[in-house]
Interface confidence: medium
Amino acid sequence: MVLEVSDHQVLNDAEVAALLENFSSSYDYGENESDSCCTSPPCPQDFSLNFDRAFLPALYSLLFLLGLLGNGAVAAVLLSRRTALSSTDTFLLHLAVADTLLVLTLPLWAVDAAVQWVFGSGLCKVAGALFNINFYAGALLLACISFDRYLNIVHATQLYRRGPPARVTLTCLAVWGLCLLFALPDFIFLSAHHDERLNATHCQYNFPQVGRTALRVLQLVAGFLLPLLVMAYCYAHILAVLLVSRGQRRLRAMRLVVVVVVAFALCWTPYHLVVLVDILMDLGALARNCGRESRVDVAKSVTSGLGYMHCCLNPLLYAFVGVKFRERMWMLLLRLGCPNQRGLQRQPSSSRRDSSWSETSEASYSGL
């Protein structure tokens, strides 16, 4: 972002909007950093902070419990399988892990919203990084699932099924590696920062405005637009192929993955639209004023809550859309409840074949 502020010019509100920075006051600025003066004062945050204080702790606590139970159940069902996991199931296991790790950070953010950040800078970095790693991982793994389905159905290329199992693991490792890379700014720039106005400490970024905007653009593109485009492209082609082949069983088998992707889009689109408004305000394309800033802050809290809800939604979707997941869950619960009962050998007819409960390859189209 290039700031065109000429000499001998008094800065007004429209011009200072782009000059907001986030360094701590003790930072010794390098000459190449933004050199300007003086910004419009930060807006009063009373309304948005009070809203966060009331809304976020309750929501985060609920999502924490639901996410932990739901994703724990998904992981348990997948890991209880005696045979090797299919490619989609492996991705879904990693997705459950990502969602679980994300919801594990929610109690910390609940405390941050309710009172202040009391966990120190170290945990601030870890929690922030963990949160973002799993935000990105969730989106990228869904894109991987859709790409796997696309190759499998449209090109009849079972990239992971016929190849060595290491291939899907390598893909997952690449996703986690990429997410770690995306989370580097969290490790570097997040810290517990004391806010003089609020007389409270919060886990915040301490870097220049241009970095904040860049990170938001990265989040928007890598964590939402790109995965969504991949999913949309892949599933559009898959549906086209399945409709042409008039394979009703195939279409039924597609339900779960399509519903999962639609859920991702519905849950995260509102948040990213708000982030887009924030980016436009950062860049000066939209005038920043205190009223708008307050509305954006509240909208961000509500829509991010909706986004985090996605972490708890996948297990519910599997439970209600995926027949096999329900059966396996039930069997697992029975096995946990009465491990020595012979009755467990009587399996429901639809799940006698030990095929994946999410797989949509020819081997298991009847599975969902």
Partner: antibody, heavy 123, light 106 residues
Framework: EVQLLESGGGLVQPGGSLRLSCAAS????????MSWVRQAPGKGLEWVAT????????YYPDSVKGRFTISRDNAKNTLYLQMNSLRAEDTAVYYC????????????????WGQGTLVTVSS | DIQLTQSPSFLSASVGDRVTITCRAS?????LYWYQQKPGKAPKLWIY???TLASGVPSRFSGSGSGNEYTLTISSLQPEDFATYYC?????????FGQGTKLEIK
């Protein structure tokens, strides 16, 4: 301890010029935006000029724009105000003041002030 | 330009009194800043961000307000509080100050 010491004030004729200096110590001068604020005898405070920490940006109110120039020498930890085409209404005590940084934003209020130097414009 | 008008301009009060100084802005400001100045001395930052007391300012001082009207309150006047108080805004440039309120001993 933060210290700001102004010098260079005195009696000058209308239309004349004067250069004020402000020696800063006790803080990292290069990290802060600086300003000049004046106070006419028995009157209130009036902001005169501001310069960014690196000296790239300068800001003035309409009352002095084109006549006054703020500058700084970061190597010497010194702030300057070059005043040209002085008028009787420029008579005042001129204070050098520091802008605090809050959350990385250079704030438009002043946390430290010098003791001031008197500039009298009179024939 | 945003004009700041302080009232009253002069205020006579006794030690122990509760005193309130008002600063009205010609258009809404986000925060207000207060300075204390004693005769022959430089101003001192007294209150920033409307209600945060600067370092070393006694707790008997408080600031409040929003939008167009802000107040500085001294709960119990002490001899050292007699001075001139100025309000300042920087919501929009140029930075402007109020004309000052001189607090005198009755």
């Amino acid at each position: 301890e933060v210290q700001l010491l102004e010098s260079g004030g005195g009696l000058v004729q209308p239309g004349g010029s004067l250069r004020l200096s402000c020696a800063a110590s006790g803080f990292t001068f290069t990290s802060y935006a600086m300003s000049w604020v004046r106070q006419a005898p028995g009157k209130g405070l009036e902001w005169v000029a501001t310069i960014s920490r690196g000296g790239t940006y300068t800001y003035y109110p309409d009352s002095v724009k084109g006549r006054f120039t703020i500058s700084r020498d970061n190597a010497k930890n010194t702030l300057y105000l070059q005043m040209n085409s002085l008028r009787a209404e420029d008579t005042a005590v001129y204070y050098c003041a520091r802008h605090p940084i809050y959350s990385g934003q250079y704030q438009g209020y002043f946390d430290y002030w010098g003791q001031g130097t008197l500039v009298t414009v009179s024939s | 330009d945003i004009q700041l008008t302080q009232s009253p301009s002069f205020l006579s009060a006794s030690v122990g009194d509760r005193v309130t100084i008002t600063c009205r802005a010609s258009s809404g400001v986000n925060y207000l800043y207060w300075y204390q100045q004693k005769p022959g001395k430089a101003p001192k930052l007294w209150i920033y961000f409307t209600s945060t007391l600067a370092s070393g300012v006694p707790s008997r001082f408080s600031g409040s307000g929003s939008g167009n009207e802000y107040t500085l309150t001294i709960s119990s006047l002490q001899p050292e509080d007699f001075a001139t108080y100025y309000c300042q805004q920087f919501t929009s440039s140029p930075y402007t100050f109020g004309q000052g309120t001189k607090l005198e001993i009755k």
